[in-house]
């Protein structure tokens, strides 16, 4: 039997792809594991292999559906299990009524690219990836600028209330290298968490011109 | 600009079926939900359900189930609701709404329905 | 169902003063809470969404709050315009169900 603190932790992106982490203290390492989706109103189920992450830790992604199909609704609930093999015969390990739309986190935002750079500002647009018609305009997001000498621990947040999938950024240094990252999250959901950070761009701002002579 | 402008109203005797259309303009109708809801004189608000465009799917409240069908027309922009088995408890206004599934964020104008005798 | 409280039934106040109109779940809806006017003769109108984010085009004078199970929309200098009915409506448990609204009149 396995004993220690178990840990189930899912995430819907809004569309065909539920993303789960079980973590179990003292589990055994060499044990075949899965998670099993049943959702309560469709006539589907889908089951995927956890493969490890860390020392007591294991991932997976339960794959639904094409990437843009709407495959639970707001309505739905599944259950969620933990399975583990035992022998012949499968245990469960740990189980969770989960609501869909109550814990979401989309896909890192796309397709960043530089609109228009100057000396001082630059402007930046992205799309959002596999996110769900429901959510209308009630999105946010988050972007931070990585300057020269910094982390981006240390990059302070933007934030824009509302889906505007564009920032103009403005008091940039003159001919410096910047790097730029955006992440979106919805306003709907009890235990929904921001998207993972979008791929870095980078960009340059144009050099000063040059004064002329007096 | 949003709009949703739905049919006229409707006089029908107990035990008809009633349906009522709602053409919208000004967004995408093919990627929306419309929704439906009920305000009869003494029973205030009441959600009857929504239809998902993109998905193709309904979804009806318990209350609701049995007596009503949302459609809707992609060509023509156009979402219906039929209610049958008329009483004279489902004499109401009936609004059409656009909005993701928890609230309504865009409202039709509201059709009168009166069951009579 | 869940069932939405909302009080008082009719809530009297002069204009340029303060009104503030209550909403109870009968059950945990976490944030799951959004109000609505509405005016003799027209639909309702979208004010605030989970509890408290304001819709765009709504004025700062409308705001919301959360409680627990009690939500509270706060109109802090009541307009002539203002004076309607203020639905609550919860999306937590299908079917999403409305509280039978506060009647905001003028004192």
């Known amino acids: 039997a396995v004993n220690g603190t178990s840990q189930f932790t899912c995430f819907y992106n809004s569309r065909a792809n539920i993303s789960c982490v079980w973590s179990q203290d003292g589990a055994l390492q060499d044990t075949s594991c899965q998670v099993h989706a049943w959702p309560d109103r469709r006539r589907w189920n889908q089951t995927c292999e956890l493969l490890p992450v860390s020392q007591a830790s294991w991932a997976c992604n339960l794959i639904l559906g094409a990437p843009d199909s709407q495959k639970l609704t707001t309505v739905d609930i599944v259950t969620l299990r933990v399975l583990c093999r035992e022998g012949v015969r499968w245990r469960v390990m740990a189980i969770q009524d989960f609501k869909p739309f109550e814990n979401l986190r989309l896909m890192a935002p796309i397709s960043l690219q530089v609109v228009h750079v100057e000396t001082h500002r630059c402007n930046i647009s992205w799309e959002i990836s596999q996110a769900s018609h429901y959510f209308e305009r009630h999105l946010e997001f988050e972007a931070r600028t990585l300057s020269p000498g910094h982390t981006w621990e240390e990059a302070p947040l933007l934030t824009l209330k509302q889906k505007q999938e564009w920032i103009c950024l403005e008091t940039l240094t003159p001919d410096t290298q910047y790097e730029f990252q955006v992440r979106v999250k919805p306003l709907q959901g009890e235990f929904t968490t921001w998207s993972p950070w979008s791929q870095p761009l980078a960009f340059r701002t144009k050099p000063a011109a040059l004064g002329k002579d007096t | 600009e949003v709009q949703l402008v739905q049919s006229g109203a409707e006089v029908k005797k107990p035990g008809a079926t009633v349906k009522i259309s709602c053409k919208v303009s000004?967004?995408?109708?093919?990627?929306?939900?419309i929704h439906w809801v009920q305000q009869a004189p003494g029973k205030g608000l009441e959600w009857m359900g929504w239809?998902?465009?993109?998905?193709?799917?309904?979804e009806y409240a318990p209350g609701f189930q049995d007596r009503v069908t949302i459609t809707a027309d992609t060509s023509t922009d156009t979402a219906y609701m039929e209610l049958s088995s008329l009483r004279s408890e489902d004499t109401a206004v009936y609004y059409c709404?656009?909005?993701?599934?928890?609230?309504?964020?865009?409202w039709g104008q509201g059709t009168t329905v009166t069951v009579s005798s | 169902e869940i069932v939405m409280t909302q009080s008082p039934a009719t809530l009297s106040v002069s204009p340029g003063e303060r009104a503030t109109l209550s909403c109870r779940a009968s059950?945990?809806?976490?944030?799951?809470l959004h109000w609505y006017q509405q005016k003799p003769g027209q639909a309702p109108r979208l004010l605030i969404i989970?509890?408290?984010q304001s819709i765009s085009g709504i004025p700062a004078r409308f705001s919301g709050s959360r409680s627990g199970t009690e939500f509270t929309l706060t109109i802090s200098s009541l307009q002539s315009e203002d004076f309607a009915v203020y639905y609550c409506?919860?999306?937590?448990?299908?079917?999403?169900?409305f509280g039978q609204g506060t009647k905001l009149e003028i004192k």
């Open positions: 000004g967004f995408n109708f093919k990627e929306s939900l």
């Open positions: 709404a656009r909005g993701g599934p928890w609230f309504l964020s865009y």
């Open positions: 409506q919860q999306s937590n448990n299908w079917p999403w169900t």
């Open positions: 239809i998902d465009n993109e998905a193709g799917e309904t």
């Open positions: 059950q945990i809806i976490s944030n799951n």
């Open positions: 989970y509890g408290l």
